[in-house]
Interface confidence: medium
Amino acid sequence: MQQDGLGVGTRNGSGKGRSVHPSWPWCAPRPLRYFGRDARARRAQTAAMALLAGGLSRGLGSHPAAAGRDAVVFVWLLLSTWCTAPARAIQVTVSNPYHVVILFQPVTLPCTYQMTSTPTQPIVIWKYKSFCRDRIADAFSPASVDNQLNAQLAAGNPGYNPYVECQDSVRTVRVVATKQGNAVTLGDYYQGRRITITGNADLTFDQTAWGDSGVYYCSVVSAQDLQGNNEAYAELIVLGRTSGVAELLPGFQAGPIED
């Protein structure tokens, strides 16, 4: 078993966020309807988010860490699907309603797990994966979202998530942090960032930053059953007006040695 709980990947690199256990290999995910049940609801929600974003952006001047920087962080937390597990399996859940936080403000991606028995401390692994397609562009292009939804429905696969479901080889994958017992270890790319795993398995950012947009996978691995690697994911999106992006990006060049 690997030390620090690192290097435990998503099943087949698919990034579908499914629970996996040898006794139920064909466990299928529930549909992910995270933008409403129809195109009109989706458009309404997109419009509401845009209005909320505008209001928050205009109020940023009073925030010392982001004065003059028109930016907001949108966080979509998606309940990743998990199946009813047999005895001794781990059940992992990532769930929280839609969040809006200001850039540089803290955010917590909740993750909880349940085990039928806990002879040893499980390893909690949070991994980051970049979006399979441009989530930000789609958020401001309701028409393209509608077209995509129609295509999904026509294909008879309403549970398909185009932002999450693609091979790891075509996107960036990083270990964010791992936790075993009380020991939390940050991945290489996140060294120097105030990020930690708190509570049961929650991933907490003391300050959100540009480049944090993506899909965050919470995996829990039991030393007793390496095949019972359950995981769930949350989507995090960092948005900002073009003028704000140029101002903010230089400040994040001083981090860990980047590839």
Epitope: Q3, L6, G7, R174, R194, A254, P256, I257, E258
Partner: antibody, heavy 114, light 106 residues
Framework: AVTLDESGGGLQMPGGALSLVCRAS????????MQWIRQAPGKGLEWVAG????????RYGSAVKGRATISRDNGQSTVRLQLNNLRAEDTGIYFC????????WGHGTEVTVS | ALTQPASVSANLGGTVKITCSGG????????YGWYQQKSPGSTPVTVI????KRPSNIPSRFSGSLSGSTNTLTITGVQVEDEAVYFC?????????FGAGTTLTV
């Protein structure tokens, strides 16, 4: 357990070159930055070089910039420091360390330039 | 440059604090580590990293705290085996830097 083992030290000639190797085990090597840090006799710690997890990002201390090359082989879990045009002031113990916020050290390998 | 006292002394069982300042600022904060070296040239041991994180093999009597841009290493209930040189380190712009070291005498 995390272990870091350095090798390649010894007596070197001024103007020559040396190649130090650090072999890592006990953790997912490719997920961590690796650093080289040295200590001259009777002196404090001096950061020499660092390399990102995938290996394409590198940084060097001012004392070795232009003379040093840090590289890594994630398949073999090794990180290498090549130091050219050796000087007497390069004498010291060279430590391999894990992560930018150093949380593990190797035992070191002694280099004498004389 | 990182600034730390050249030496400090402590009574057995007492508490000692070693400060370090001058670290580099990154992502709106400062990041320090503390490294214990019991004899010159021996392997350093990380006692605190990322300001206040303690490796699992380090006794709980070691703690770190950040106040402004200054980091403090506190050893509560000093033991004889804590006698060593303590180097503070900071992380800035993908580089590490170290202080000159503080000799702790028990």
């Amino acid at each position: 357990a995390v272990t870091l083992d350095e090798s390649g030290g010894g007596l070197q000639m001024p103007g020559g070159a040396l190649s130090l190797v650090c072999r890592a085990s006990g953790f997912d090597f490719s997920s961590y930055e690796m650093q080289w840090i040295r200590q001259a006799p009777g002196k404090g710690l001096e950061w020499v070089a660092g390399i990102s997890g995938a290996g394409s990002g590198t940084r060097y201390g001012s004392a070795v910039k232009g003379r040093a090359t840090i590289s890594r082989d994630n398949g073999q879990s090794t990180v290498r420091l090549q130091l050219n045009n050796l000087r007497a002031e390069d004498t010291g113990i060279y430590f391999c360390a894990r992560s930018s916020n150093i949380d593990a050290w190797g035992h070191g390998t002694e280099v004498t330039v004389s | 440059a990182l600034t730390q006292p050249a030496s400090v002394s402590a009574n057995l069982g007492g508490t000692v604090k070693i400060t370090c300042s001058g670290g580099g600022r990154y992502a709106e904060s400062y990041y320090y580590g503390w490294y214990q070296q019991k004899s010159p040239g021996s392997t350093p041991v990380t006692v605190i990293y990322w300001n206040d994180k303690r490796p699992s093999n380090i006794p709980s009597r070691f703690s770190g705290s950040l106040s402004g841009s200054t980091n403090t290493l506190t050893i509560t209930g000093v033991q004889v085996e804590d006698e060593a040189v303590y180097f503070c380190g900071s992380y800035e712009d993908s580089r590490s830097a170290f202080g000159a070291g503080t000799t702790l005498t028990v």
